[in-house]
Interface confidence: low
C-alpha cells in the first residue's frame, strides 16, 4: 500500500490511509488511570461542569484516498479528524495555530468520533482490472468523552452530544452510522 501524501484544508500533510482510525493509546489498556500519582483516580479538572455546551473539541476536515490492496479511489474523500484533547469551548481556538490550547492535567478527556456516514467510492485498480466500488465509513462529527474512574473500553462519559444526534422518531440520512468509535487511521480492512 502506498503512502502518498497530500494536503487537507488545514494545510497539513496527510498520508494515504485505509478505512479505520485507531483508538488513542490510553484506551488500549485499563491501567491508564491507575497510576500512583493519581491514586487510581482521574486528576481534578477545574473546568468540569454540568453545562455540556461548555465542552468542545476540534473537528478538522481532511482529504484522503481510500485504498483496497493495490486499488485506490478515483477521487479523495473528505472527512473529519477529531483532534486532541477536549476543553471548555470558550478556550478552544477557531483556527489552527491561533489562541491558547487548553489541556487538562491528565489524559482523561478525549475528542473522538461521534457519528459516521457511509460513502460509496469507486476504486481504480492497476493492470487493467475493472474498477471496484466500496463503501467506507467516514467520521461525520466529533464529541468529547471523559474517561471515568477505573475505566475500561466502554466506560466513557459523553459530553454535549445530544444535539448532534438525530431526534427520536426521525430517520437520519440513509446510511448515516449514528455511532462513535475511533480515531487516527489504520490498516485496510481487506
Amino acid at each position: 500500500q502506498g503512502w502518498q501524501a497530500f494536503k487537507n484544508d488545514a494545510t497539513e500533510i496527510i498520508p494515504e490511509l485505509g478505512e479505520y482510525p485507531e483508538p488513542p493509546p490510553e484506551l488500549e489498556n485499563n491501567k491508564t488511570m491507575n497510576r500512583a500519582e493519581n491514586g487510581g483516580r482521574p486528576p481534578h479538572h477545574p473546568f468540569e461542569t454540568k453545562d455540556v455546551s461548555e465542552y468542545s473539541c476540534r473537528e478538522l476536515h481532511f482529504t484522503r484516498y481510500v485504498t483496497d490492496g493495490p486499488c485506490r479511489s478515483a477521487k479523495p474523500v473528505t472527512e473529519l479528524v477529531c483532534s486532541g484533547q477536549c476543553g471548555p469551548a470558550r478556550l478552544l481556538p477557531n483556527a489552527i495555530g491561533r489562541g491558547k490550547w487548553w489541556r487538562p492535567s491528565g489524559p482523561d478527556f478525549r475528542c473522538i468520533p461521534d457519528r459516521y456516514r457511509a460513502q460509496r467510492v469507486q476504486l481504480l485498480c492497476p493492470g487493467g482490472e475493472a474498477p471496484r466500488a466500496r463503501k467506507v465509513r467516514l467520521v461525520a462529527s466529533c464529541k468529547c468523552k471523559r474517561l471515568t474512574r477505573f475505566h475500561n473500553q466502554s466506560e466513557l462519559k459523553d459530553f454535549g452530544t445530544e444535539a448532534a444526534r438525530p431526534q427520536k422518531g426521525r430517520k437520519p440520512r440513509p446510511r448515516a452510522r449514528s455511532a462513535k468509535a475511533n480515531q487516527a487511521e489504520l490498516e485496510n480492512a481487506y
Epitope: 488500549e28 457511509a118 449514528s178
Partner: antibody, heavy 116, light 111 residues
C-alpha cells in the same frame, strides 16, 4: 489469516447467565467493529450486537438490557455476557468482523441452549 | 426500520442459472448499494459471497454475481453446481438502529 473462534456456549436454565468469548487473530483487532449474530435452530440469521473500536455498544431490541457486548483489545477477545436468558435465546452464536458495513469473516459458532 | 424479504426456496439443475431475490420495505435498499449476500452450508458458519450489491470477495467464484433494481437486490448463480446447495441470506445496514438486517434466507436445492 483471519480467524475468529467462539467459546463459552452450553446448556443453561431460563433466567441463568452465560458468557461467550471470541478469540481473534490474523488482523488488527482493535481497529475493527465486531458483532455477534445468532441463529436459532432451523431459523435464519439475527444480528444481536455490535461494538465499535472505542467500546461503544449497540443491541438488537430483543436482547437490550440483558446482553452486554465488550472487548479486550489487549487479549484480542470479544465477549458477550448474557443474563436473564430465555428459551428463545437458544441459538448458535457467531462473532463476525464488521468491515465496510458487512461481515467479511465469521467464527464457527458456539451453541447456547436455554432449557429447564 | 428496514425489512428484507426473500423466497423461502429456489431450485435448479446443474449447469443452470438461478436468481434469488431480496426485496426491501424501505427505499434505502434501492437508493444505496449496500446489500450483502451470505452462503451457509448446514452446520457451517455463513460466508460472505457478495457485498455492496455486486462485489465479490477474493476467493469467491465468478459464477456468483449480484445486481439490484429499485428496492430489489438479486443474487444470480450461473453454471449451478452441487456444492452451491445451501442457504443464502441477503443483508443490509440499518442506519438508525446501527444494526445489520438479514433477510429470512432462501434454501437453494440443486436437483
Amino acid at each position: 489469516q483471519v480467524q475468529l473462534v467462539e467459546s463459552g456456549g452450553g446448556l443453561v436454565q431460563p433466567g441463568g447467565s452465560l458468557r461467550l468469548s471470541c478469540a481473534a487473530s490474523g488482523f488488527t483487532f482493535r481497529s475493527h467493529w465486531l458483532s455477534w449474530v445468532r441463529q436459532a435452530p432451523g431459523k435464519g440469521l439475527e444480528w444481536v450486537s455490535v461494538i465499535t473500536p472505542y467500546g461503544d455498544t449497540y443491541y438488537a431490541d430483543s436482547v437490550k438490557g440483558r446482553f452486554t457486548i465488550s472487548r479486550d483489545n489487549s487479549k484480542n477477545t470479544l465477549y458477550l455476557q448474557m443474563n436473564s436468558l430465555r428459551a428463545e435465546d437458544t441459538a448458535v452464536y457467531y462473532c463476525a468482523r464488521d468491515t465496510y458495513l458487512h461481515f467479511d469473516y465469521w467464527g464457527q459458532g458456539t451453541l447456547v441452549t436455554v432449557s429447564s | 426500520d428496514i425489512a428484507l424479504t426473500q423466497p423461502a426456496s429456489v431450485s435448479g439443475s446443474p449447469g443452470q442459472s438461478i436468481t434469488i431475490s431480496c426485496t426491501g420495505t424501505s427505499s434505502d435498499v434501492g437508493d444505496i448499494n449496500d446489500v450483502s449476500w451470505y452462503q451457509q452450508h448446514p452446520g457451517k458458519a455463513p460466508k460472505l459471497m457478495i457485498y455492496d450489491v455486486n462485489n465479490r470477495p477474493s476467493g469467491v467464484s465468478n459464477r456468483f454475481s449480484g445486481s439490484k433494481s429499485g428496492n430489489t437486490a438479486s443474487l444470480t448463480i450461473s453454471g449451478l453446481q452441487a456444492e452451491d446447495e445451501a442457504d443464502y441470506y441477503c443483508s443490509t445496514y440499518d442506519g438508525p438502529g446501527l444494526s445489520e438486517v438479514f433477510g429470512g434466507g432462501t434454501k437453494l436445492t440443486v436437483l
